[in-house]
């Protein structure tokens, strides 16, 4: 580290006075100081001499004496005060910047140390400071404004109590710069815009920024717009608006429109599109297929998407049949608008009951008219099934009807002993209908069909079921014959009771 | 006022059925779908089925093959009956007044036991 | 079929407390989500329906919201008589319950 004679923290001297400061390294040394006249440097290898056989108050300061090739960057400083009755200030600089929330440091130095208890800080003219200014001394450096904030960029002045009067130093200028996070803020509204030709329009770009310095303009299709500019200030922003304001529009009107703002941070810029029709419109459509099947019981939401302008003047769903003149509930449709012109509409059916399948129209209007979209809803069934015995051209036939969504298959089988259902083990015979004669088949509704097993003699210690399954589940029915006649015997699982 | 009362506990062999009935007063089954709901021993509600207004049935499809749910509209009273049962059946069973989108009145509850 | 989770399983809490439960939807049932209390031996009560409408003679400490897939029932200050377990139930599709909340006395 190097070594500073005289070897004091502080040297005070009256101006005039002859002062040597003499710095000794092993290597090569600098001097670094306040910038300051009448100063001569000499070295001397290891050494280095500033001398001046006339100091001023201007050579307060602190000198600091560094070695450049330490590795560890070692140095020694010394504080001159040239102690002027006339002048208590030496006044480094007079515009400091600084930004907001930073330590922002005056740069005026006591010439004398004796002085320390009476320094203040005012405002030129000897106003007051503002209100929760935060600041300290120090008779090395100056005054230190702690936090300083936007509000704070004044014109300050040192003041020192000389035999009872107050002496100020030159003033210092303030500039407290706010943080600009990045570039301004932007809102381009509408962010969509539809408009009828003939029809008024209104566009607004508007740019805010912590800082004043900031450029704001609005372009169609690469077009800069010549619009007189708004001014503002509020919410501790400066905001600059750009009002686009057309009495009828046409199709050169139309395409896209850019809110472009820049600043020393950078640009940003948000885009509309500016659509002209020539009348009004209205969309239906739905990313579901028009013909949905759900199996009852469950619940199914249908949705609709709208585009439309001008608004909706109404809308509804209706259920159009074929079972019960039931409408849905309002409370199951509920409305969601994406955008402006863009809305979903959805009819929620929770636990689909039988009578609740068929034809939902979705209707809306608009001054161009109305419009509708069906869905179509077929529900799914697990298969019903019942047999009888009966006797079809004198010969003896068990007929099992099976009614179910989609088509029920029909599987008969014939076992041993008498069951409610034929297990595995049992089966002395199994038939599948391929073609069973549907019975009926609407639109909407279960699907009937009839299987016939003609069977010459029924053995009576033997069970004779009818199966049919489809997509949903299965059913299934047991015939039982017995001595006295033939009796049939529904399992518990059957869902139809004949 | 509105109340579901339910038949009393059944202990039942495994195989066999059971039928458990629920009578409704202070309001009418020709208004109100019934729904059966299920709770074994320290476990959540399992929802078996339901018996609309108009008598069809809608079965939760674990139940499907063993459940048959009926009702008689002039006593006012729905049933229940499981077959094929096994040990796992042994649960508390509810009837329920159903208003599609909740439950709103319990009977208070039947017992049955499965077992050997 | 839609599965319900609820959460927590159980709950320690003290008379005053305000109390949370939450219930998960694997998929969207709007708000067509039910709460029922039940108490050890008794039948399940109906609280809450339609997610957030409280049931005619439910004191209002009760409430629930959500929509969708999320939902909870709050219990604003717990009472000595809301100590039971709690169920959500949705009735989108085919009835499903959660698996049920024990809140108990801390």
């Known amino acids: 580290i190097p070594v500073i004679e005289p070897s004091v923290p502080e040297l005070v001297v009256k101006p005039g006075a002859t002062v040597t400061l003499r710095c000794v390294g092993n290597g090569s040394v600098e001097w670094d100081g306040p910038p300051s006249p009448h100063w001569t440097l000499y070295s001397d290898g290891s050494s280095s001499i500033l001398s001046t056989n006339n100091a001023t108050f201007q050579n307060t300061g602190t000198y600091r004496c560094t070695e450049p090739g330490d590795p560890l960057g070692g140095s020694a400083a010394i504080h001159l005060y040239v102690k002027d009755p006339a002048r208590p200030w030496n006044v480094l600089a007079q515009e400091v910047v600084v930004f907001e929330d930073q330590d922002a440091l005056l740069p005026c130095l006591l010439t004398d140390p004796v002085l320390e208890a009476g320094v203040s800080l005012v405002r030129v003219r000897g106003r007051p400071l503002m209100r929760h200014t935060n600041y300290s001394f120090s008779p090395w450096h100056g005054f230190t404004i702690h936090r300083a904030k936007f509000i704070q960029s004044q014109d300050y002045q040192c003041s020192a109590l000389m035999g009872g009067r107050k002496v100020m130093s030159i003033s210092i200028r303030l500039k407290v710069q706010k943080v600009i996070p990045g570039p301004p803020a932007l809102t381009l509204v509408p962010a969509e815009l539809v408009r009828i030709r003939g029809e008024a329009a209104q566009i607004v770009c508007s740019a805010s920024s912590v800082d004043v310095n900031f450029d704001v303009f609005l372009q169609h299709n690469n077009t800069k717009l010549a619009i007189p500019q708004q001014s503002d200030f509020h919410n501790n922003r400066y905001q600059k608006v750009l009002t686009l304001n057309l009495d009828q529009v046409d199709f050169q009107h139309a395409g896209n429109y850019s809110c472009v703002a820049s600043n020393v941070q950078g640009k940003h810029s948000t885009s509309m599109f500016f659509r002209v029709v020539e009348s009004a419109y209205l969309n239906l459509s739905s990313e579901q297929n028009l013909i949905q099947e759900v199996t009852v019981g469950e619940g199914l939401n249908l949705k609709v998407m709208v585009e439309a302008y001008p608004g909706l003047q109404g809308f509804n769903w209706t259920y159009l049949g074929p079972f019960s003149d039931h409408q849905p509930e309002p409370k199951l449709a509920n409305a969601t608008t994406k955008d402006t012109y863009r809305h979903t509409f959805t009819l929620s059916l929770p636990r689909l009951k039988p009578s609740e399948a068929g034809r939902y129209s979705f209707l809306a209007r608009n001054p161009g008219g109305w419009r509708a979209l069906t869905f179509e809803l077929t529900l799914r069934y697990p298969p019903e099934v019942s047999v009888i015995w009966t006797f079809i051209n004198g010969s003896g036939t068990l007929l099992c009807a099976a009614s179910g969504y989609p088509q029920p298959n029909v599987t008969w089988l014939q076992c041993s002993g008498h069951t409610d259902r034929c297990d595995e083990a049992q089966v002395l015979q199994v038939w599948d209908d391929p073609y069973p004669e549907v019975l009926s088949q609407e639109p909407f509704h279960k699907v009937t069909v009839q299987s016939l097993l003609t069977v010459e003699t029924l053995e009576h210690n033997q069970t004779y079921e009818c199966r049919a399954h489809n997509s949903v589940g299965s059913g299934s029915w047991a015939f039982i014959p017995i001595s006295a006649g033939a009796h049939t015997h529904p399992p518990d699982e059957f869902l139809f009771t004949p | 006022q509105v109340q579901l009362v339910q038949s009393g506990a059944e202990v039942k062999k495994p195989g066999s059925s059971v039928k458990v009935s629920c009578k409704a007063s202070g309001f009418s089954l020709t208004t109100y779908d019934i729904s059966w709901v299920r709770q074994a021993p320290g476990q959540g509600l399992e929802w078996m089925g339901v018996?609309?207004?108009?008598?069809?049935?809608n079965y939760n499809s674990p139940f499907m093959s063993r459940v048959t749910i009926t009702k008689d509209e002039s006593t006012s009273t729905a049933y229940m009956e499981l077959s094929s049962l096994r040990s796992e059946d042994t649960a508390v069973y509810y009837c329920?007044?159903?208003?599609?989108?909740?439950?709103?009145?319990w009977g208070q509850g039947t017992t049955v036991t499965v077992s050997s | 079929d839609i599965q319900m989770t609820q959460s927590p399983s159980s709950l320690s809490a003290s008379v005053g407390d305000r109390v949370t439960i939450t219930c998960r939807a694997s998929?969207?049932?709007?708000?067509?989500v039910s709460w029922y209390q039940q108490k050890p031996g008794k039948a399940p009560k109906l609280l809450i329906y339609g997610a957030s409408s409280l049931q005619s003679g439910v004191p209002s400490r009760f409430s629930g919201s959500g929509s969708g897939t999320d939902f909870t029932l709050t219990i604003s200050s717990l009472q000595p008589e809301d100590f039971a377990t709690y169920y959500c139930?949705?009735?989108?599709?085919?009835?499903?319950f959660g698996q049920g909340t024990k809140l108990e006395i801390k």
């Open positions: 139930g949705q009735s989108f599709s085919y009835p499903t």
């Open positions: 018996i609309w207004t108009d008598g069809g049935t």
């Open positions: 998929e969207d049932v709007n708000t067509y």
């Open positions: 329920v007044r159903d208003q599609r989108l909740y439950f709103d009145v």
